[in-house]
Interface confidence: medium
């Protein structure tokens, strides 16, 4: 396995793709199939990715670089490197424990992933609401009231809301 | 000198669990894929689990898939099963061989699932 | 799963004389590199397997060399040219190239007449 490393180590000539075969005087041996060194000097050649199941390969395993993964259609990828593959929804719901659920109401989702945002409040920015939000699109927040006086604008003033950023769904 | 020593075995009740541990000395534990693979008395040695050198890949075998999960903790230079609703026929020496090809083996610990 | 098959499961055999061990498995092992991935193991009464010959013919360190291996694709052969008493134990094939998972043959038992 490992020996004191000298200035004349056999090991450090072994390149990525191989490794220094303790069993054979420490010659270069190439790595195994289904593993991969990506630096010269190794030991041993590690385990490669397996991409099985929900998971789909991107990129094969080489001898010097480690397989790649993503999802196959209708999951996508979460965490570094996609280490797990989390399955779509439709675009105005959220994935929940008991599956996709549609966005309650005040709330939208414009993607297949991710969880339901509320709408945005436009009275927060003294606007008003010019296109309805629904459970896939947020709401447009026009200009305010004070905005749409006589030649101000040539929009349409929105037919006034009961409560900025609601709609019926 | 490579040394591998397994350890946590003993004797458990079926649907209990059970952590076995493996330290690791004398070559460079972070470099090296590890794994479990044990024998049942009387009986040869069946692969359990395998698991990358820095920890990101897992791999079982389907009698223990979703049972057992396999880690590693390389600052420690220690390897870890941890065993769920264990049966009887998990009942069995557990080794932690190193490497990709198994070069080196631990003594094992014995592992007794049992009512 | 590649299955490993090993004749004969029991060997009793005589000390000085040769032996022969056979294992074959049901998908080829030679990859296109030219190597066969199949790995040898013996296991010696109340020890734990220790690695003897990889990649189908080549010795792990420290193994004497009355043992070898041979074969090629499925077919596979261990032989010790003079068994000692020391050799006795259950000798194991198992397969290293579709790995994981990896598979071992049933496991051999060789014993002294």
């Known amino acids: 396995f490992e020996r004191t490393r000298s200035l004349q180590d056999p090991c450090s000539n072994c390149p990525a793709g191989t490794f220094c075969d303790n069993n054979r005087n420490q010659i270069c041996s190439p790595c195994p199939p289904n593993s991969f060194s990506s630096a010269g000097g190794q030991r041993t050649c590690d385990i490669c990715r397996q991409c099985k199941g929900v998971f789909r390969t991107r990129k094969e395993c080489s001898s010097t670089s480690n397989a790649e993964c993503d999802c196959t259609p209708g999951f996508h990828c979460l965490g570094a490197g996609c280490s797990m593959c989390e399955q779509d929804c439709k675009q105005g719901q959220e994935l929940t424990k008991k599956g996709c659920k549609d966005c309650c109401f005040g709330t939208f989702n414009d993607q297949k992933r991710g969880i339901c945002r509320p709408w945005t409040n436009c009275s927060l920015d003294g606007k008003s609401v010019l296109v309805n939000g629904t459970k896939e699109r947020d709401v447009v927040c026009g200009p305010s009231p004070a905005d749409l006086s006589p030649g101000a604008s040539s929009v349409t003033p929105p037919a006034p809301a009961r409560e900025p950023g609601h709609s019926p769904q | 000198e490579v040394q591998l020593v397994e350890s946590g075995g003993g004797l458990v009740k079926p649907g209990e669990s059970l952590r076995l541990s493996c330290a690791a000395s004398g070559f460079t534990f972070k470099s090296y894929p590890m794994a479990w693979v044990r024998q049942a008395p009387g009986k040869g040695l069946e692969w359990v689990s395998s698991i990358s050198s820095s920890g990101d890949h897992r791999y079982y075998a389907d009698s223990v898939k979703g049972r057992f999960t396999i880690s590693r903790d390389n600052a420690r230079n220690s390897l870890s099963l941890q065993m769920n609703n264990l049966r009887a026929e998990d009942t069995a020496v557990y080794y932690c061989p190193a490497g990709r090809d198994f070069d080196h083996w631990g003594r094992g610990t014995l592992v007794t699932v049992s009512s | 799963d590649i299955v490993m098959t090993q004749t004969p499961l029991s060997l009793p055999v005589t000390p000085g004389e040769p032996a022969s061990i056979s294992c074959r498995s049901s998908?080829?092992?030679?990859?296109?590199?030219?190597?066969?991935?199949l790995d040898w193991y013996l296991q010696k009464p109340g020890q734990s397997p220790q690695l003897l010959i990889y990649w189908g013919s080549n010795r792990a360190s420290g193994v004497p060399d009355r043992f070898s291996g041979s074969g090629s694709g499925t077919d596979f052969t261990l032989k010790i040219s003079r068994v000692e008493a020391e050799d006795v134990g259950i000798y194991y094939c198992?397969?290293?190239?579709?790995?994981?998972?990896?598979?071992f043959g049933q496991g051999t038992k060789v014993e002294i007449k």
């Open positions: 998908q080829s092992l030679l990859y296109s590199n030219g190597y066969n991935y």
């Open positions: 198992m397969q290293a190239l579709h790995v994981p998972p990896y598979t």
